[in-house]
Interface confidence: medium
């Protein structure tokens, strides 16, 4: 993979090493915590950056609370097993034989168990719903204006295909985005679903994964859009099992 | 670094038509937003018309349906067809590049790398 030739970093990933050791003295970037090769022309896989995150930890984030509705990354951050594609790995297991499944955003959707526990396929989260809560603003933002804003950065920033914008809800101060991608809507090439919800999330966080010198300026005709409170659901192509005792906590 | 060479300015009536050209080198011209900016003697550079890899182009008010803009990111060129053109559309036209996957604005500070400019002369 090649990345900029002028100082040889990677643009869509800046928890990356590069250096020019690619073939003919091309610049390869290499992701930080796995030393996995990565294609700076695309967006770098949720579980590589979560891989790279934990190789360099920063204080805990404040984690949103599970919904009876989806699942919710109410687990936090951990140190991830990713295939040789940079998938995360069906199970995943914690340095005390703790094991658990996940769905293709590495989100847990079964109980706990032990290295017993087996997880025989990587489910795949095909809706995210992206639930937004935007601060007071002079008026509400006229809903077409920013519907259009929105799929534009999605598709120009994260290069999601407009057809996974399912659709832009928004009752003042909420604004929703549903993304949808099943399994045979992918196609080769074509931005996952779940890598540009993760890196629409840290933009919004002000945490851009981005190598660029800025953070997101998201605007509606000129008006800042800032964001005070993020939720995001995962819905999977087949339904999480957990427990009872879970369902009803 | 990334280089810019504008072509196709000129002296045109009003009324009449110019197709302006730049070629692009350098590293992820593809996934940079791009831009045409102008400026006249005294005045700041004003965007006319930006573009993301994959998006549409957005323009100045005062070049909206006139100007077109479009890019090919195959032979690393961007274009800028001017009809209808006016008096006041004369300036120096400059075409730029921004930060590799940010979004197209046409804001100047957005963009980093400039070309040396190719200048456009509207008389009446």
């Known amino acids: 993979h090649t990345a900029a030739q002028d100082n040889c970093t990677c643009p869509t990933n800046k928890m990356t090493v590069c250096s020019p050791d690619g073939p003919g003295g091309r610049c390869q970037c290499r992701a930080l915590g796995s030393g996995m090769a990565v294609d700076c022309s695309t967006l770098t896989s949720k579980c590589l950056l979560l891989k790279a995150r934990m190789s360099a930890p920063k204080n805990a984030r404040t984690l949103v609370r599970p919904s009876e509705h989806a699942l919710v990354d109410n687990d936090g951050l951990y140190d991830p097993d990713c295939d040789p594609e940079g998938r995360f790995k069906a199970r995943q297991c914690n340095q005390t034989s703790v094991c658990w499944c996940v769905n293709s955003v590495g989100v847990r959707r079964t109980d706990k168990g032990d290295l017993s526990l087996r997880c025989d396929e990587l489910v795949r989260t095909h809706h995210i719903l992206i639930d937004l809560r935007h601060r007071p603003t002079a008026g509400a933002f006229n809903h077409s204006d920013l519907d259009a804003e929105l799929r534009r950065l999605f598709r120009e920033r994260y290069r999601l295909h407009p057809k996974f914008v399912a659709a832009v809800h928004y009752e003042q101060p909420t604004i929703q985005i549903e993304l949808r991608q099943n399994t045979s809507q992918k196609a080769a090439g074509d931005v996952d679903i779940g890598d540009a919800a993760y890196y629409f999330e840290r933009d919004i966080k002000g945490e851009s994964l981005f190598q660029g010198r800025g953070g997101l300026d998201l605007r509606v005709r000129g008006e800042p859009l800032q964001v005070e409170r993020t939720l995001i659901y995962y819905l999977d192509e087949i339904p999480p099992k957990f427990s009872m005792k879970r369902l009803t906590a | 670094q990334v280089q810019l060479q504008e072509s196709g300015g000129g002296s045109v009536l009003a009324g009449g038509s110019l197709r302006l050209s730049c070629t692009v080198s350098?590293?992820?011209?593809?996934?940079?937003?791009m831009a045409w900016f102008r400026q006249t003697p005294g005045k700041e550079r004003e965007g006319v018309a930006a573009i993301s890899q994959y998006g549409d182009p957005k323009y100045a008010g005062s070049v909206k349906g006139r100007f077109t803009m479009s890019r090919d990111n195959a032979k690393n060129t961007l274009l800028l067809q001017m009809n209808s053109l006016k008096p006041e559309d004369t300036a120096i036209y400059y075409c730029?590049?921004?930060?590799?996957?940010?979004?197209?604005?046409?804001?100047?500070?957005?963009?980093?790398?400039w070309g040396q400019g190719t200048q456009v002369t509207v008389s009446s």
């Open positions: 350098g590293s992820f011209v593809s996934s940079r937003s």
């Open positions: 730029a590049a921004g930060e590799a996957w940010e979004l197209a604005t046409l804001s100047r500070s957005d963009y980093i790398y």
